[in-house]
């Protein structure tokens, strides 16, 4: 199936041009999405092109500026947040990135009633996290690893925690490993629905080994970056959850929430917190060996001013074939009875589906079923449940939004998006207003992305929010590559692939092939989304065929494929890329002497192992910021899939699955190894060890480091990186510059 929807091309072919590398590096063909910042059932905020903050009322059709660009500019604000009582706005400036999600910033509070900034008891700087209460205008913020509370923006702060210490104790914010591998947020505090209570996590990193690397900067001496970072098998952070009454914070102070006994008996993680009501909270815990998760529903005991988590309200989720959940353990979406909930987990056939849980997990009612997967529950109302899945037409790389009518029996299912713009849109997400009165649909492709507003009752489209007209016009004279998504059936395994073909592709000719791989557990590369990126350029201008293959270990096709890699990373992911390459050669249009593979991060690990597979299939390849040994990577991620690097667990495979162990096999390939020296995630150590092993084996290779760059290799490094990789591939494929 050809995914790029046909466009009316100018009949004069010579007005069409190929993509250039400059187009890609300049972001010439980037697209916009529109996510409303919902503030009620029918109102949302949006930052206009000229930087005014505008409030839109869908029902009256009116809009007005609540905050002018002049006010924003007066403090160089790059972000804002309206208090729920609409009296104040926080303005965020001096953004300073830390890790993937975390950053510090300076915050100013603007009083909308008098049009002035709040003076007196100003916020300290820089702040690590700040948020409004869900009702009114209380503020909670984290400064120097401690949590503070303000009843009103102009009030003096109440200090909730006192033990916060850099790299030692983190209150209300996660440490490195929790941020990257467990919470996927910059915060670790949660307001109750009406702002009565504030829950927060405390992470104790005192005993965690530290990764230290040089940051060269511009000074005479480099400085050393120290991060408590637990690698596989190392000591982990110790987590505790506390809840404080924000109305009378000094009365009893923070109260610790008890950990379920079956979890507390050995090393464990806290995985998420969900407020149900102001006096009921749901915590999810996970054993360090991540195949057992416990969901615990806790109630406030007015008489004792404590939180009680009865054993009868503990729900266990266990995997016998792999780890618990997908990438993360799913979170519950509670029903209006404030006790039962909807949750995605594996059904008896090994597909992730929505279940309804009331008394016990054993008595769960399965809501969706089939040989496809439910991916996200967006919203549950009194009569509808909205979710996304890849059910439609059996394409795992699609996402459509469905509505299940749960107010009647049997619940009826309707696909909201399947037939809206079928050629253009096959990959959606959604954003819902309060009570799902309205929602925005954001379509990511395969055609040009489009965002639309819909009535939550009838699903009628109300208006287009963003249709990327400028992008559509800009692409009119561009020869884009053709894209197709198909599958290979190999030994009872389905390998979905995306192939990107040169514009004038001719099956009777031979083309160089580049495999782009990620391949990490629970990832998906073959998706029906729009992209004009580096590989689009390589196909359009340089005449390469590019393929992406989802092999074993990838997501949304059932547990058999997903958990195939459990405790055995680096084996089947590589085998499946190789198998696909052989199938592509059989198709007849691939020049088997010009095949390359490249990947970044996990993809760098897979591409390195594929190059060192000894098959002779690959002429050359690139690894950007690869993992080289699972002993070097984060405990939370690595142990989820590999277990522990101990003799009585899985040390043998930890040792067998390193890139270094295969150094000899790089002798007959051209290898380009790339890494940022300030990579906090996949440490430069990984590439340093590959390089050392190659040198010790006297194997020639090419390398590039990016000084002071992290895992993303951003800014000017990006341009240098893609230019460098382009030269490398063109040389490998004997393409003239």
């Amino acid at each position: 199936i050809v995914l790029r929807p046909p466009r009316v091309h100018n009949s004069e072919e010579n007005t069409m041009r190929a993509l250039t590398l400059k187009d890609i590096l300049n972001g010439t063909f980037s697209y916009k999405t529109f996510f409303p910042n919902w503030i009620s059932g029918q109102e949302y905020l949006h930052q206009s092109a000229d930087n005014n903050i505008v409030l839109y009322n869908i029902e009256t059709g009116q809009s007005y500026t609540i905050l002018s660009n002049r006010t924003m500019k007066s403090v160089n604000a790059s972000n804002y947040g309206l208090s729920p009582d609409r009296q104040f706005v926080y303005l965020e400036s001096d953004y300073s990135k830390l890790w993937r999600y975390s950053y510090t910033a300076t915050y100013y509070i603007y009083d909308l009633s008098n049009g002035e900034f709040v003076r007196g008891n100003e916020l300290p700087r820089p702040i690590q996290y700040l948020c409004w209460s869900p009702v009114g205008s209380k503020l909670a913020y984290v400064y120097q690893n401690n949590i503070y509370l303000k009843q009103r923006p102009g009030d003096p702060p109440f200090q909730i925690t006192f033990n916060g210490r850099e790299n030692k104790i983190f209150n209300g914010i996660p440490d490195w490993v929790y941020e990257e591998e467990m919470l996927a947020t910059k915060y670790a505090l949660w307001w109750s629905p009406n702002g009565k209570f504030l829950a927060y996590a405390e992470f104790n990193d005192t005993d965690i080994p530290v990764i230290a690397y040089s940051y060269y900067g511009d000074e005479q001496y480099p400085r050393t970056i120290n991060i408590p970072y637990p690698k596989a098998g190392a000591k982990n952070p110790f987590v505790r959850i506390f809840i404080i009454d924000t109305t009378y914070p000094a009365y009893v102070g923070p109260q610790e929430v008890p950990v379920p006994a079956m979890i507390a008996s050995s090393d464990y993680y806290f995985s998420w917190l969900t407020w149900v009501t102001d006096e009921r909270v749901c915590l999810q815990w996970l054993k360090r060996v991540q195949n057992v998760s416990v969901l615990s529903i806790c109630d406030f005991r007015e008489d004792w001013q404590t939180w009680d988590c009865p054993k009868t309200q503990e729900h266990i989720e266990e995997s016998r074939t792999g780890w618990a959940g997908g990438f993360f353990v799913s979170t519950p979406v509670f029903s209006y009875d404030a006790i039962s909930y909807y949750k995605i987990f594996s059904d008896k056939d090994g597909y992730k589906h929505i279940h309804y849980i009331k008394d016990t997990v054993e008595n769960a009612i399965q809501i969706t079923s089939g040989k496809w997967e439910a991916i996200n529950i967006f919203r549950v109302t009194q009569d509808s449940l909205f979710y996304s899945s890849n059910e439609f037409e059996d394409y795992p790389g699609r996402r459509n939004i469905y509505r299940i009518s749960i107010g009647s029996y049997p619940p009826s299912k309707k696909c909201v998006t399947c037939h809206l713009r079928k050629e253009r849109c096959q990959y959606y997400t959604a954003s819902f207003s309060d009570y799902a009165k309205y929602y925005a649909l954001v379509c990511y492709g395969p055609g040009i992305p489009i965002s639309t507003l819909h009535d939550g009752r009838t699903d009628q489209e109300i208006k287009i929010l963003e249709e990327n007209k400028e992008l559509e016009n800009a692409l009119k004279n561009i020869q884009l590559p053709k894209e197709e998504i198909k599958k290979l059936e190999v030994d009872e395994i389905t390998l979905w692939y995306k192939m990107i073909l040169p514009p004038q592709f001719d099956r009777s000719k031979k083309y160089p092939l580049l495999i782009q791989v990620y391949g990490g557990p629970c990832s998906q590369s073959v998706r029906s989304v729009f992209a004009v990126n580096w590989i689009s350029y390589l196909a359009s201008k340089e005449g390469m065929v590019i393929a992406l293959v989802d092999g074993r270990g990838t997501a949304f096709q059932g547990d058999k494929l997903l958990y195939a890699v459990y405790r055995k990373l680096g084996v089947y992911e590589v085998e499946d890329q190789i198998t696909a390459v052989r199938k592509f050669i059989e198709m007849g249009f691939i020049d088997e002497k010009r095949i390359a593979i490249w990947g970044w991060s996990y993809g760098g690990y897979v591409s390195s192992l594929a190059l060192a597979s000894g098959t002779g299939l690959f002429k050359c390849g690139i690894a950007v910021a690869p993992v080289s040994s699972w002993e070097y990577y984060a405990s939370v991620y690595t142990e989820r899939f590999m277990g522990l690097p101990t003799k009585d667990d899985n040390l043998e495979h930890y040792k067998n699955s390193t890139v270094m162990a295969r150094a000899e096999y790089f002798r007959n390939v051209d290898y380009l190894l790339i890494h940022g020296t300030a990579d906090d995630n996949v440490h430069f150590q990984n590439s340093a060890q590959i390089a050392k092993a190659l040198v010790n084996a006297q194997v020639d290779f090419q390398a590039m480091w990016y000084s002071d760059q992290n895992h993303g290799l951003s800014g000017l490094s990006t341009n240098h990186l893609y230019t460098h990789m382009t030269h490398f591939l063109k040389q490998c494929f004997s393409l003239s510059d």
Epitope: P310, T312, Q313, S335, Y336, D337, A338, I339, S340, Y356, K358, D359, T360, N363, I365, Q382, D383, I406, G407, S408, Y409, P410
Partner: antibody
Framework: EVQLLESGGGLVQPGGSLKLSCAAS????????MSWVRQAPGKGLEWIGE????????NYTPSLKDKFIISRDNAKNTLYLQMSKVRSEDTALYYC???????????????WGQGTTVTVSS | ELQMTQSPASLSASVGETVTITCRAS??????LAWYQQKQGKSPQLLVY???TLADGVPSRFSGSGSGTQYSLKINSLQPEDFGSYYC?????????FGGGTKLEIK
């Protein structure tokens, strides 16, 4: 008008078997969860079990699980209770009950039959 | 298995009076509770579900309340047709047990 009509009751010897039926009309039987409830002479109500519309979920009170079987035939709009290994304490008035779907995912017993009497005696 | 304890087992009241029947669950049933009325020689009739929602056609003098493990059924201004037996039943987890019943008699 909703009607549930139980039949099949009577005298049965200890250790014997009996099959009760409940004919439904006046509502969408094939979309309703159905239950059996019994009441011993002069005593209170005892829940026996329930069955969902497509018979994929059947729940029993633990003490009766091994001797009673609930089933249904949606084509005939009929609910069944197969009783086996009966004892004198199974003597009771047996009701079938059906109900409305209540959000979220449970069913109340909104309508009841008039009951059929089972007497276990030698 | 959750036990339902109903009290009182019996009570006498006059027409026009207000009475309250209580039901205690051996564990939290989270408002998944129904109340039934049964008149002599008749089948039970649903009065209340979700602990406090009146079933269709039930007079407003009946009201249900409670949470957690403690629930009650209140009948304001008793009418002659209100006399009979009353049962609570939980719907939290199977088996859906009934309370022992309360016999309401005319004084």
């Amino acid at each position: 008008e909703v009607q549930l009509l139980e039949s099949g009751g009577g005298l049965v010897q200890p250790g014997g078997s009996l099959k009760l039926s409940c004919a439904a009309s006046g509502f969408d039987f094939s979309r309703s969860w159905m239950s059996w409830v019994r009441q011993a002479p002069g005593k209170g109500l005892e829940w026996i079990g329930e069955i969902n519309p497509d018979s994929s979920t059947i729940n029993y009170t633990p003490s009766l699980k091994d001797k009673f079987i609930i089933s249904r035939d949606n084509a005939k709009n009929t609910l069944y209770l197969q009783m086996s290994k009966v004892r004198s304490e199974d003597t009771a008035l047996y009701y079938c009950a059906g109900g409305y779907y209540r959000y979220p995912y449970y069913y109340t017993m909104d309508y009841w039959g008039q009951g059929t009497t089972v007497t276990v005696s030698s | 298995e959750l036990q339902m304890t109903q009290s009182p087992a019996s009570l006498s009241a006059s027409v026009g009076e207000t009475v309250t029947i209580t039901c205690r669950a051996s564990g939290n049933i989270h408002n998944y509770l129904a109340w039934y009325q049964q008149k002599q020689g008749k089948s039970p009739q649903l009065l209340v579900y979700n602990a406090k929602t009146l079933a269709d056609g039930v007079p407003s003098r009946f009201s249900g309340s409670g949470s957690g493990t403690q629930y009650s059924l209140k009948i304001n201004s008793l009418q002659p047709e209100d006399f009979g037996s009353y049962y609570c039943q939980h719907f939290w987890s199977t088996p859906y047990t009934f309370g022992g019943g309360t016999k309401l008699e005319i004084k």
